[in-house]
């Protein structure tokens, strides 16, 4: 969490941002809140990106003002116009690109004063893994697949029964470049699996950590997946 204060002849207002990550090809949110004003027409929101000449987005007098918008953001940004009055300056970024990563500034002017806060935005690809029993294999084998990751993640297997065991010798992980030549499909195979055990396939890069669990018993198979974004800090 980053909290910024304005310093000027005018009063300062508190602006708060939260570091976040965007999944390339999908829509993302750059989070920013501020001390609300009673009049929408008095609120100006400006989003900037470090190193970019034009604005990312500007909202003033109750509507978007995009005359100074940088070409790299054209047609891809929107604020939540109905929530600006209650202090929400968050930006929706459509079709997140790898190049959208960087430091952003949420800059607010109201009748009470002005303030700003920076936000670190990471971009990459992350997806939920699915673990299945590979019935085609000669021995009991698990196959963990996740369709989209970038940068290349690490894959680690763990087991509830053999806690702390190193499965690197009995597993094999491959990365297959997807058609858009950026993201990769992750496939990891675990051999010599024992029954009545829960196995976890953990995929992690500097943006996200995802886990796929599978519990194999004689009577049933149970699966569970979980994805967590890393380094979400407020500012």
């Amino acid at each position: 969490l980053i909290i910024g204060f304005g310093i000027s002849g005018r009063h300062s207002i508190t602006v708060t941002t939260v570091a976040s990550a965007g999944n390339i090809g999908e829509d993302g949110i750059l989070s920013c809140t501020f001390e609300p004003d009673i009049k929408l027409s008095d609120i100006v929101i400006q989003w900037l990106k470090e190193g970019v000449l034009g604005l990312v987005h500007e909202f003033k007098e109750g509507k978007d003002e995009l005359s100074e918008q940088d070409e790299m953001f054209r047609g891809r940004t929107a604020v939540f116009a109905d929530q600006v009055i209650v202090g929400n300056a968050s930006l929706r970024l459509k079709n997140v690109q790898l190049t959208d990563a960087g430091t952003y500034k949420c800059y607010i002017i109201t009748s009470k004063g002005k303030g700003n806060a920076n936000l670190e935005y990471k971009t990459g690809a992350f997806s939920m893994p699915e673990v299945n029993v590979d019935y085609n294999a000669s021995s009991e084998t698990l196959r963990c697949e996740a369709p989209r990751w970038f940068p290349q993640p690490t894959v680690v297997w763990a087991s509830q029964v053999d806690q702390g065991a190193n499965f690197s010798e009995v597993s094999n992980t491959s990365f297959e470049l997807n058609s858009e030549n950026v993201t990769m499909k992750v496939v990891s195979v675990l051999y010599n699996v024992t029954i009545n055990n829960t196995y976890s396939c953990m995929i992690e890069n500097d943006i996200a950590k995802a886990t796929g669990d599978i519990k194999v018993t004689e009577s049933e198979i149970k699966r569970r997946s979980h994805l967590q974004l890393l380094n979400s800090k407020a500012s």
């Epitope: 310093i7 000027s8 190193g51 970019v52 000449l53 070409e71 990563a101 800059y107 700003n116």
Partner: antibody
């Protein structure tokens, strides 16, 4: 650590040409717009030119428009300033600088251009 | 183009003094003003951007204020290393950008 290192300055006759280079390191070069600023001997700072991170947009001061060309090679992390039809008033130390939030947050040490016959 | 007028052009001060430099723009530039420090033979160094945001690593004795057309750089307690020339720069919208004429802070 962000580093910008200019080169290519020197003595040139009026009407001549020179190409300045600025080698960048310590940051993702293609993500940042870059700029050239000059300073004539004993004078103040004068903004010369700027270029977007992709190289698709370029901007010039009126005093150099049509004579100077800014460009970049993102694969080489290098910024350029091609200076043609040089005049005595172009004599200055030329700095390359990285654009931050609408300000120049890192500067090189400068390279000296002298236009004289 | 937008013109920037800095005043004074020079100021004599002693260590510990409070020093104020002003910069006036010929038209409204909102908060898009930066301040730089330059020492002889050295490249300029960014102190303040967006009128009042302190650049990382810059001592807190430097502060900026203002919006619209009138801006101020204040050094709350002048230190020996602060004797230098200070420039303001406007960066509203896309370039061209302009610098003020500079203010030299000298030892009294």
């Amino acid at each position: 650590e962000v580093q910008l290192l200019e080169s290519g300055g020197g003595l040139v006759q009026p009407g001549g040409s020179l190409r300045l280079s600025c080698a960048a390191s310590g940051f993702t070069f293609s993500s940042y717009a870059m700029s050239w600023v000059r300073q004539a001997p004993g004078k103040g700072l004068e903004w010369v030119s700027a270029i977007s991170g992709s190289g698709g947009s370029t901007y010039y001061a009126d005093s150099v428009k049509g004579r100077f060309t800014i460009s970049r090679d993102n694969s080489k992390n290098t910024l350029y300033l091609q200076m043609n039809s040089l005049r005595a008033e172009d004599t200055a130390v030329y700095y390359c600088a990285r654009v931050g939030f609408r300000a120049l947050n890192y500067w090189g040490q400068g390279t000296t251009v002298t236009v004289s016959s | 183009d937008i013109q920037l007028t800095q005043s004074p052009s020079s100021v004599s001060a002693s260590v510990g003094d409070r020093v104020t430099i002003t910069c006036r723009a010929s038209q409204d530039i909102s908060s898009w003003l930066a301040w730089y420090q330059q020492k002889p033979g050295k490249a300029p160094k960014l102190l303040i951007y967006a009128a009042s945001s302190l650049q990382s690593g810059v001592p807190s004795r430097f502060s900026g204020s203002g919006s619209g057309t009138d801006f101020t750089l204040t050094i709350s307690s002048l230190q020996p290393e602060d004797f230098a020339t200070y420039y303001c720069q406007q960066a509203t919208s896309y370039p061209p950008w302009t610098f003020g004429g500079g203010t030299k802070v000298e030892i009294k």
